[in-house]
C-alpha cells in the first residue's frame, strides 16, 4: 500500500446498522493531516476481492473497487481534511453486512480500525385504535422489518402482564420478497391506560405507545439501533 509514515495514528470506527434499500453510513475518524494530498483512505470488506472505496490525493481512486460496491460509495470529501473518513453507502443491500476495515495513511503515519456492519430492515411502528373490531382493539403496524422480529405488548397499568394470549401478530412479505410488514392486534383493551407495542430483532428495537382516554388518544414512537454506539 505505499506507506508514507512510520508511526501509528489513531483511527476510530463505530459499529452500525444499515436499513436495506436506504443509504447508510460507515463511521470512521482519524488524526487529521494538514495536507489533503497526503491523506489516503481505504475501505475494505473482509472476504471481498476488491476494494470498497479508495480516496487519495484529494479524489476518489476506484480502479480496484469491487463490483459489488460500484456506484454506491462516497466519502465526505470536504470533511477528510478534518479527520472524517466515514463512508456513505447507497442503497444498502442485505449482503453488505460484515466486517469492514477503515485504513488510513497520512504524513504522520498509518492506522486502521475494523467495524461490524449489520444490515436488515427496521421501521417505526404506529399504534391505532381499531374501530372496526367488535371489542376495544389496538392495531400496531410497522411497514418494513428483517429479520423477522418479535412483538411484545405491555401496559402501564398492568405492568408485567403477559399479553400473548390476547394478541395476534402476523408477518406479511413485502413485494421485494425480503422485508416484511408487521401487524399485531391487541384485544380487550381498557381505556385510561397506555399500551406499548415493542418490535425487536437483532438489529433494532422500536416501540409504539398509545395512550387512550375518554377524551383523547396520544401516540409516540421510538426506534433504537442495537449493538451500536451511535
Amino acid at each position: 500500500f505505499g506507506i508514507s509514515g512510520r508511526h501509528s495514528i489513531t483511527v476510530t470506527t463505530v459499529a452500525s446498522a444499515g436499513n436495506i434499500g436506504e443509504d447508510g453510513i460507515l463511521s470512521c475518524t482519524f488524526e487529521p493531516d494538514i495536507k489533503l494530498s497526503d491523506i489516503v483512505i481505504q475501505w475494505l470488506k473482509e472476504g471481498v476481492l476488491g476494494l470498497v472505496h479508495e480516496f487519495k490525493e484529494g479524489k476518489d481512486e476506484l480502479s480496484e473497487q469491487d463490483e459489488m460496491f460500484r456506484g454506491r460509495t462516497a466519502v465526505f470529501a470536504d470533511q477528510v481534511i478534518v479527520g472524517n473518513a466515514s463512508l456513505r453507502l447507497k442503497n444498502v443491500q442485505l449482503t453488505d453486512a460484515g466486517t469492514y476495515k477503515c485504513y488510513i495513511i497520512t504524513s504522520k503515519g498509518k492506522g486502521n480500525a475494523n467495524l461490524e456492519y449489520k444490515t436488515g430492515a427496521f421501521s417505526m411502528p404506529e399504534v391505532n385504535v381499531d374501530y372496526n373490531a367488535s371489542s376495544e382493539t389496538l392495531r400496531c403496524e410497522a411497514p418494513r422489518w428483517f429479520p423477522q422480529p418479535t412483538v411484545v405488548w405491555a401496559s402501564q397499568v398492568d405492568q408485567g402482564a403477559n399479553f400473548s394470549e390476547v394478541s395476534n401478530t402476523s408477518f406479511e412479505l413485502n413485494s421485494e420478497n425480503v422485508t416484511m410488514k408487521v401487524v399485531s392486534v391487541l384485544y380487550n383493551v381498557t381505556i385510561n391506560n397506555t399500551y406499548s407495542c415493542m418490535i425487536e430483532n437483532d438489529i433494532a428495537k422500536a416501540t409504539g405507545d398509545i395512550k387512550v382516554t375518554e377524551s383523547e388518544i396520544k401516540r409516540r414512537s421510538h426506534l433504537q439501533l442495537l449493538n451500536s454506539k451511535a
Partner: antibody
Framework: EVQLLESGGGLVQPGGSLRLSCAAS????????MSWVRQAPGKGLEWVSA????????YYADSVKGRFTISRDNSKNTLYLQMNSLRAEDTAVYYC???????????????WGQGTLVTVSS | DIQMTQSPSSLSASVGDRVTITCRAS??????LAWFQQKPGKAPKLLIY???SLEGGVPSRFSGSGSGTDFTLTISSLQPEDFATYYC?????????FGQGTKVEIK
Amino acid sequence: EVQLLESGGGLVQPGGSLRLSCAASGFTFSSYAMSWVRQAPGKGLEWVSAISGGGGSTYYADSVKGRFTISRDNSKNTLYLQMNSLRAEDTAVYYCARDIQWFGESTLFDYWGQGTLVTVSS
Amino acid sequence: DIQMTQSPSSLSASVGDRVTITCRASQSIRSWLAWFQQKPGKAPKLLIYKASSLEGGVPSRFSGSGSGTDFTLTISSLQPEDFATYYCQQYNSYSRTFGQGTKVEIK
C-alpha cells in the same frame, strides 16, 4: 488445521450438469473469499470462479460465464460449483482454494483441496 | 481480461544453479502477483504473494521482485526438490489469471 475437500466429480455427457462441493474446516470460512481453479490433463492452471466471504459477490472467468454458478453455505462451511451445459473442454481436475481475506493485506490461494476430476465425454 | 505471459515455458538446470523465471502482465497489476509451485499429481503450493512476500514455511532461496507489469521469481540455488512447474498469478481487484507455467527440469 485448514482442510479443503472436494467432491462431486465424475463422468458426464456434453450438455450435461454436475455440482461440485468443497467442504472446509480449520478456519473461519465466512471470513474468506473462495475460488475454484481447474487444470485440464497435461495443461496449466485456469482460474474459474470466486465468491466473496458473505456470498454477495460472485466472479467468473469468461470461459464459464453463464454456464457455471458458484455459491456457498456458510452455515455448512461448504463451497459449491454448479456446472451446466458442460463441454469437452471443461474436462479437468477442479480444485477449490482459499482466496483472500482482506484485499491487499493477506495471502491468497494458500490452501488447496486435493482436486476432483470432471470428465465430459460421450 | 488481464493476460499473463511467462517465460521461458521450460528450462533445464542443475542442482545449485541460480534460476530466474519472468512473468509479464498485459496491463499494470501493481504488486498483486503470486507465484506457485506444482509437482505432478499434487495441488499447487503458494510460494510468494504481493510480488515479493515470502509465504510462511517457504525456503528463503525463493524470492520475488517486480511491480506494474514485469515480475521475476528467482531460486538462488536450485535444490533437488525444486524441480517442478512454476506459475505466476495476478490478482488485481476481482479477477485472477495464471501464467501458462514454466517447467524446471533436471539438466
